[in-house]
Interface confidence: low
């Protein structure tokens, strides 16, 4: 027989020869970092037809590192599900806990023994310091000094000294999140009051009131013969300004045809219709009413005025 087979996990005992006699036996041993588990044989024999009898290194198993328990409030996850040398152990903390120490340990060989590269980490509870205090407001649990993961506080505004109340700008509730950081910035409390919105040649159709505070919403429509330039809905924003700005009602220019269209209703509210002037022949004005997809109104190609051309 020629040289005996080579393996990943076991090696020949002694030096190989170029040729072996029929009936000659060779023995293997497990390589460094592997250990033998019976009953599989680790030897082979040169048989009559000049081939080696079947043998494998299945009997040699990788050295394994000591078992590691899951850290308290966490998990130890062996990569590839194994503790064998050359592999890693990953550590994960449960939600609400964070890792102190190495996130990954390596199973390494020291001599012929497999040991971990370091100490297993621990999982500490995520804690947050009290959330920020805000001017003109307070939050729940203000007496608590330490907050745990997902603990929530809710902010509210103080009563205002004057006639107008404080408005809460931002999210009222925040919670203690990962990395001991509150989920978002604290809100603010301030007086937000928008001017009374006036639209000439139009009227308010909802959101009536004498005073308009934060998030007050007002809707408008234009009088007959006028169309809306801007948004039909405006909201009082945190800067005490209307967002979008208060719209205008502009006059619809009549078409330069002999028969003016009999408008059955006003052209208004962010309408997607064309103005008659833009549908008729003859000289056209330099403006065009804005086009949008305001729900409940026809799209430009379905304009209610098209049939009047």
């Amino acid at each position: 027989c020629e040289e005996p087979p080579t393996f990943e996990a076991m090696e020949l005992i002694g030096k190989p020869k170029p040729y072996y006699e029929i009936g000659e036996r060779v023995d293997y041993k497990c390589k460094k970092g592997y250990f033998y588990i019976p009953p599989l044989a680790t030897h082979t024999i040169c048989d009559r037809n000049h081939t080696w009898l079947p043998v494998s290194d299945d009997a040699c198993y990788r050295e394994t590192c000591p078992y590691i328990r899951d850290p308290l409030n966490g998990q130890a996850v062996p990569a590839n599900g194994t503790y064998e040398f050359g592999y890693q152990m990953h550590f994960i903390c449960n939600e609400g806990y964070y890792l102190i120490g190495e996130e990954i340990l390596y199973c390494e060989l020291k001599g012929s023994v497999a040991i971990w590269s370091g100490k297993p980490p621990i999982c500490e509870k995520v804690l947050c310091t009290p959330p920020p205090k805000i001017k003109n407001g307070k939050h729940t649990f203000s007496e608590v000094e330490v907050f745990e993961y997902l603990d929530a506080v809710t902010y509210s505004c103080d009563p205002a000294p004057g006639p107008d109340p404080f408005s809460l700008i931002g999210e009222s509730t925040i919670y203690c999140g990962d990395n001991s950081v509150w989920s978002r910035a604290a809100p603010e409390c301030k007086v937000v009051k928008c001017r009374f919105p006036v639209v000439e040649n139009g009227k308010q159709i909802s959101g009536f009131g004498k005073k308009f505070y934060y998030k007050a919403t007002v809707m408008f429509e234009c009088d007959k013969g006028f169309y809306l330039d801007g948004s039909d809905t405006i909201v009082c924003d945190s800067n005490s300004t209307w967002d979008p700005p208060v719209p205008k009602c502009l006059k619809v220019l009549p078409p330069s045809s002999t028969k003016p269209p009999a408008l059955s209703h006003s052209v208004s509210t962010s309408s997607t219709t064309k103005s008659p002037a833009s549908s008729a022949s003859g000289p056209r004005p330099t403006y065009k009413p804005p086009v949008s997809n305001y729900p409940g109104y026809p799209k430009p190609e379905e304009g209610i005025l098209d049939s009047l051309d």
């Epitope: 994960i92 449960n94 939600e95 999210e171 990395n179 950081v181 509150w182 978002r184 910035a185 604290a186």
Partner: antibody, heavy 117, light 112 residues
Framework: QVQLQQSGAELARPGASVKLSCKAS????????ISWVKQRTGQGLEWIGE????????YYNEKFKGKATLTADKSSSTAYMELRSLTSEDSAVYFC??????????WGQGTSVIVSS | DIVMTQAAPSVPVTPGESVSISCRSS???????????LYWFLQRPGQSPQLLIY???NLASGVPDRFSGSGSGTTFTLRISGVEAEDVGVYYC?????????FGGGTKLEIK
């Protein structure tokens, strides 16, 4: 390797509903949020909302309230988004992404939704 | 909602050159805890977005160190030192200081 596997493309009629899924693997599903992001053809990214599977808490972009509903099944490590009353404006690719505090570090491959009569 | 603005819709660049992509927020993204909640993503053609930078300046796992992020409370920059062909795509900034998370309109990096 962390993976988010999203369900296949959907073709739906206007007014109908669809439910998209996002199956997470190789991480602790309950330790992270799942965000959903919309992208219309040739357009930018729009955040729809986020669900925290451990608590079931959801946070929505106001624009998508009433349009999208986010749920999660801890037992199968799967997040879902249902879109209802579909219109052509809802035709887009929808991504799910793993994250906590905005760091959306792993994304699904996206699910295309086409709304057409 | 916080508005994120990426003024340049596209940036042409020669491979090997360095490039900066800017982003502006309508409100400071600096939290009182010292973190700035600004993130950068790259969406390569036909792919899902990929996280590059988190909390303004931290490099995400597996991202080459030719990418870096910097900025103040409202003005942010993503810098790529020595652009490679694989860097082409659309770069988005995103804030997570407040819900809803909002993205910039995107800046397309094109190779000259």
């Amino acid at each position: 390797q962390v993976q988010l596997q999203q369900s296949g493309a959907e073709l739906a009629r206007p007014g109908a509903s669809v439910k998209l899924s996002c199956k997470a693997s190789d991480y602790t599903f309950t330790s992270y949020g799942i965000s959903w992001v919309k992208q219309r053809t040739g357009q930018g990214l729009e955040w729809i909302g986020e669900i925290f599977p451990r608590s079931g808490n959801t946070y929505y972009n106001e624009k998508f309230k009433g349009k999208a509903t986010l749920t999660a099944d801890k037992s199968s490590s799967t997040a879902y988004m249902e879109l209802r009353s579909l219109t052509s404006e809802d035709s887009a690719v929808y991504f799910c992404a793993r994250g906590l505090g905005g760091a959306m570090d792993y994304w699904g491959q996206g699910t295309s939704v086409i709304v057409s009569s | 909602d916080i508005v994120m603005t990426q003024a340049a819709p596209s940036v042409p660049v020669t491979p090997g050159e360095s490039v900066s992509i800017s982003c502006r927020s309508s409100k400071s993204l600096l939290h009182s805890n010292g973190n700035t909640y600004l993130y950068w993503f790259l969406q390569r053609p036909g792919q899902s977005p990929q996280l590059l930078i988190y909390r303004m300046s931290n490099l995400a796992s597996g991202v080459p160190d030719r990418f870096s992020g910097s900025g103040s409370g409202t003005t942010f920059t993503l810098r790529i030192s020595g652009v490679e062909a694989e860097d082409v795509g659309v770069y988005y900034c995103m804030q997570h200081l407040e819900y809803p998370c909002t993205f910039g309109g995107g800046t397309k990096l094109e190779i000259k």
